[in-house]
């Protein structure tokens, strides 16, 4: 906002390679747009459609990828009478190299090959224990032998010193198809490694982004307090302690003799005090006697500890 009245914008010689469909959002009042001096390769569908007042568009590029995604541009420019200052020549595919986009027949704008990499194996959401090594794998295919670069992002930030393993397997079909694989190695993971990871594979024709895979780092529960065997008399209060740490925080659950349906629970004489890590049974009865199990569970796993409650008649 604040630029909706801008009428003239010059972006000459700014190393612009592609024009995204939202590149000029908020500039609906533009009348003159100069993108000259940029080796533009692609213009996304309807990139200029919101600029209803556009009278002059300058483009001078001999780098256009004349595939199916560019098919819309020549008729749109002609329909809006904006072709006068547009010098746009195909660089790819080879069969259209050197031709003006205005002289290429519409049926020749095809996507037979896939010059821009296409993701074929997505990184997968995973859970890891603290201290373990994990890896994310991402593969892409391309029919271009143009050099490929690999990057990984964590929570939308590029990992600058990522431990990556990159390799290429070449298929020899009618033309060569390159199968690129990038592996992100995360060694001895900590909670700081938690986040959403995404691979970015880029060549001369553009970048492809994988899905985001979440890494959750867990710690198995471990007891900080365990229940002890106790002997008490009927009508008194039984007190059993149990607490555990872990990541995520473990949930504590109690069972008696392997089941959750026991007298103290049914009769609402069972009370759990989360802040005190204490399990109470009030007004103890003879049939409350048995083995009580405290189970601490989180997504990493579970642990149990037992205590025997012996009840004596008063």
């Amino acid at each position: 906002s604040g630029l909706d009245s801008l009428s003239k914008l010059t972006l000459f010689g700014n190393k612009i390679k592609s024009v995204a469909k939202r590149a000029f959002s908020g500039l609906e009042g533009l009348e003159h747009l100069n993108l000259g001096g940029n080796a533009i390769r692609s213009v996304q569908f309807d990139a200029f459609v919101k600029m209803k007042n556009l009278k002059e568009l300058h483009i001078s590029s001999d780098s256009f990828l004349c595939d199916c995604q560019l098919k819309w541009l020549p008729p749109w420019l002609i329909g809006r009478m904006l072709q006068a200052f547009v010098t746009a020549t195909c660089a790819h595919p080879e069969s259209l190299k050197g031709q003006s986009i205005f002289s290429v027949p519409p049926e020749s704008f095809v996507c037979d090959d896939f010059l821009k990499p296409q993701i074929i194996t997505q990184p997968e959401t995973t859970m890891a224990m603290v201290g373990k090594d994990i890896r994310f794998t991402c593969s892409a295919a391309s029919s271009s032998s143009s050099p490929m670069t690999f990057a990984w992002k964590k929570d939308n930030e590029v990992l600058t010193n990522a431990d990556m393993e990159n390799f290429v397997h070449v298929h020899a079909q009618d033309g060569e198809v390159m199968e690129y694989t990038t592996i992100l190695h995360l060694r001895q993971v900590t909670f700081g490694h938690e986040g959403r990871y995404q691979c970015v594979i880029t060549n001369h024709f553009g970048s492809t982004y994988s899905h985001k895979a979440r890494l959750t780092v867990n710690v198995l529960p471990s007891f900080t307090k365990t229940p002890h065997d106790i002997t008490i008399r009927t009508t008194t209060v039984a007190r059993l302690e149990c607490a555990a740490t872990g990541h995520p925080n473990p949930q504590i659950a109690w069972q008696k003799d392997g089941g959750t349906d026991f007298p103290a629970a049914r009769e609402r004489r069972m009370h759990v005090m989360p802040d005190d890590d204490v399990f109470f049974i009030t007004d103890v009865k003879i049939d409350d006697a048995g083995v009580y199990s405290c189970t601490a569970q989180n997504s990493a796993g579970s642990i149990s500890a037992n205590a025997t409650l012996t009840v004596l008649e008063t």
Epitope: I120, T137, P147, F167, H169, V170, A172, T181, H185
Partner: antibody, heavy 127, light 112 residues
Framework: EVQLLESGGGLVQPGGSLRLSCAAS????????MSWVRQAPGKGLEWVSV????????YYADSVKGRFTISRDNSKNTLYLQMNSLRAEDTAVYYC????????????????????WGQGTLVTVSS | QLVLTQPPSVSAAPGQRVSISCSGS????????VSWYQQVPGSAPKLLIY???KRPSGIPDRFSASKSGTSATLGITGLQTGDEADYYC????????????FGGGTKLTVLR
Amino acid sequence: EVQLLESGGGLVQPGGSLRLSCAASGFTFSNYAMSWVRQAPGKGLEWVSVISHGGGSTYYADSVKGRFTISRDNSKNTLYLQMNSLRAEDTAVYYCARVISNCHLGVCYYSNGMDVWGQGTLVTVSS
Amino acid sequence: QLVLTQPPSVSAAPGQRVSISCSGSSSNIGDNYVSWYQQVPGSAPKLLIYDNNKRPSGIPDRFSASKSGTSATLGITGLQTGDEADYYCATWDGSLSAGRVFGGGTKLTVLR
């Protein structure tokens, strides 16, 4: 001299385990994908497994999937094959082989060929 | 059963030319490069050809190979007695993750 030397073969009972090693020398081990290939007595070559140059990717023949594990220690220039739940049909000479790889600017290009082979180690699975 | 089909045996006299075929499908040979190996009895295999038609250093140009569609062919000219061996073709089956496959092997006999 570029060399691969396998070890760890021997006689093992069905259901048993064995770990093969392949010591590499004379080349930058961490720049090459590596493979295991076996040959049963009097039979042809059978591909077993391959591992990428950094160890991040591993692939297996269906006949050994879930039973065999390929790994590598680039600091020791050594390739391994852990073989569990061995069967009589796993009896073979096991070769380790180097996949032609061309590494440039952090990317390794894997060719189809395996250009360096070890002398093989015999694994016999029998009761 | 074997994915790549080779003739079990071929034979020719010294000095002659011999061809060994390797037949597959669109998912293996049709989609990937082919390599060829020579194995003398009692020895480890040796790479002769990789990436359809490339020779490693040290392999004489008497050995050549070609690929057309779903078939590949190894050619040996000026046959020598030392060429008597088993020959195997190999390729990837589908993508990298599907793994590598070998042909059943062809025994080359050099007639004396």
